[in-house]
Interface confidence: low
Amino acid sequence: QNCSGPCRCPDEPAPRCPAGVSLVLDGCGCCRVCAKQLGELCTERDPCDPHKGLFCHFGSPANRKIGVCTAKDGAPCIFGGTVYRSGESFQSSCKYQCTCLDGAVGCMPLCSMDVRLPSPDCPFPRRVKLPGKCCEEWVCDEPKDQTVVGPALAAYRLEDTFGPDPTMIRANCLVQTTEWSACSKTCGMGISTRVTNDNASCRLEKQSRLCMVRPCEADLEENIKKGKKCIRTPKISKPIKFELSGCTSMKTYRAKFCGVCTDGRCCTPHRTTTLPVEFKCPDGEVMKKNMMFIKTCACHYNCPGDNDIFESLYYRKMYGDMA
């Protein structure tokens, strides 16, 4: 909508907004619309909720068409019913250290996420929860048959992760980057965010990327073979173009999407990477947005809405991202 022209308000009366969502005037001061919420895509026509201190963050000047609703600098966070100040770090449980930054919470695991392969002194490693201990620990089962030790050693590799990666310490800055959050939409285009200080000034900043776990129109259950319960990564049928608020990706992509599980488990991205995607809008404007691309998916029981607010949140995050 061109704000210099007459107002164009297609609906009378105003739309009804979900509970907790403000009814606001659009960016042209013309039409009443439901305000976009934290992490949602926004445009001049789709403003962010001002009553929650949100603004439309467009990123680079070249992307002034579509942004992401972001909390103003210094906005607090509400996490697990507690309000935290921006910049404040807290332990959500014994397993996670979290930081609030301008309304967004980023968390890092305190427990080692290492993979332990067989070694001469521990040919059969197994992770167990020990009484009185927060983190699961590796224990070594005695082999029932000593002859299997030899083949097991072929895979021996030391993977201790007890301290920060030395490559992540630079110029008096301990670089910390949280995992990417789960995609804001279970189907269709959504947003994923993370918090990092991996920048020249070592300052915490929020990063966001577009994400699509699966297209909404795909009827994935049809593809599950008889007797099977899950299709983790359906075969890519054909190259597609991504759509974003009326703008179309300039290239086609042979993207992987996550499938579905019929046994009550959730199927979410497990390993992902982030790549820039250029979108061309109807008026000819081109904008570049970072987007998540899925490498592998995993089926698990830590579904959105599970009881442990953080466990379900964390295990839905993306691992192994190369961006």
Epitope: Q1, G5, C9, D11, E12, P15, G188, T248
Partner: antibody
Framework: QVQLKQSGPGLVQPSQSLSITCTVS????????VHWIRQSPGKGLEWLGV???????DYNAAFMSRLSITKDNSRSHVFFKMTSLQTDDSAIYYC????????WGQGTTLTVSS | QAVVTQESALTTSPGGTVILTCRSS?????????ANWVQEKPDHLFTGLIG???NRAPGVPVRFSGSLIGDKAALTITGAQAEDDAMYFC?????????FGGGTKVTVL
């Protein structure tokens, strides 16, 4: 009660123009916009354009060059004019009130034929 | 120009519930598409049911409700009646123009 009444010709020759007047009652043209839509067997419902309550207009890009919508608020008239008619413009033309297209005119059946 | 897609036909029984959907070819339908639903009865009698995604037009029975389901707009008829046997069109707004869907014929058997 809210009503939209259309008046206009039924038969027009190719290359000629179509003019329809939509007279509204029960509401003000300064409060609601008025849309124009046509229905033809081959194409279903086609949105043609709108004149908004404040006088601005928007048109279907496919008809932009030959469509004009104006209004007279005081007389509660909305005027629709389409030029350079061809046989495939034969259809039923409707005016409808903005706000969910809640009220429609009775329709003007147009046949473009020589 | 965007293409708006609807189911061609749906059948329900009296008292049943039927959900009609409206999909946009250029991405998810949002509140900014101001989804409208229009009913057509025989003899080209049109009535607007829903405007602005979920606002019922004056005099429209409460059994008609509009919403967004996933990336589509939806019209739900809860407790269908014989007089709901009709053609239903959705229309989506794209910043400067509306596009109508092809319509869904609802049969109440």
């Amino acid at each position: 009660q809210v009503q939209l009444k259309q008046s206009g010709p039924g038969l027009v020759q190719p290359s000629q123009s179509l003019s329809i007047t939509c007279t509204v009652s029960g509401f003000s043209l300064t409060t609601f916009g008025v849309h124009w839509i046509r229905q033809s067997p081959g194409k279903g419902l086609e949105w043609l354009g709108v004149i908004w309550r404040r006088g601005g207009t928007d048109y279907n890009a496919a008809f932009m060059s030959r469509l004009s919508i104006t209004k007279d608020n005081s007389r509660s008239h909305v005027f629709f004019k389409m030029t350079s008619l061809q046989t495939d413009d034969s259809a039923i033309y409707y005016c409808a009130r903005d706000g969910g297209f809640d009220y429609w005119g009775q329709g003007t059946t147009l046949t473009v034929s020589s | 120009q965007a293409v708006v897609t609807q189911e061609s036909a749906l059948t329900t029984s009296p008292g049943g519930t039927v959900i009609l959907t409206c999909r946009s070819s250029i991405g998810a339908v949002t509140t900014s598409n101001y989804a409208n639903w229009v009913q057509e009865k025989p003899d080209h009698l049109f009535t607007g049911l829903i405007g602005g995604t979920s606002n019922r037009a004056p005099g429209v029975p409460v059994r008609f409700s509009g919403s967004l389901i996933g990336d589509k707009a939806a019209l739900t008829i809860t407790g269908a009646q014989a007089e709901d046997d009709a053609m239903y069109f959705c229309a989506l707004w794209y910043s400067t123009h509306y596009v109508f869907g092809g319509g869904t014929k609802v049969t109440v058997l």
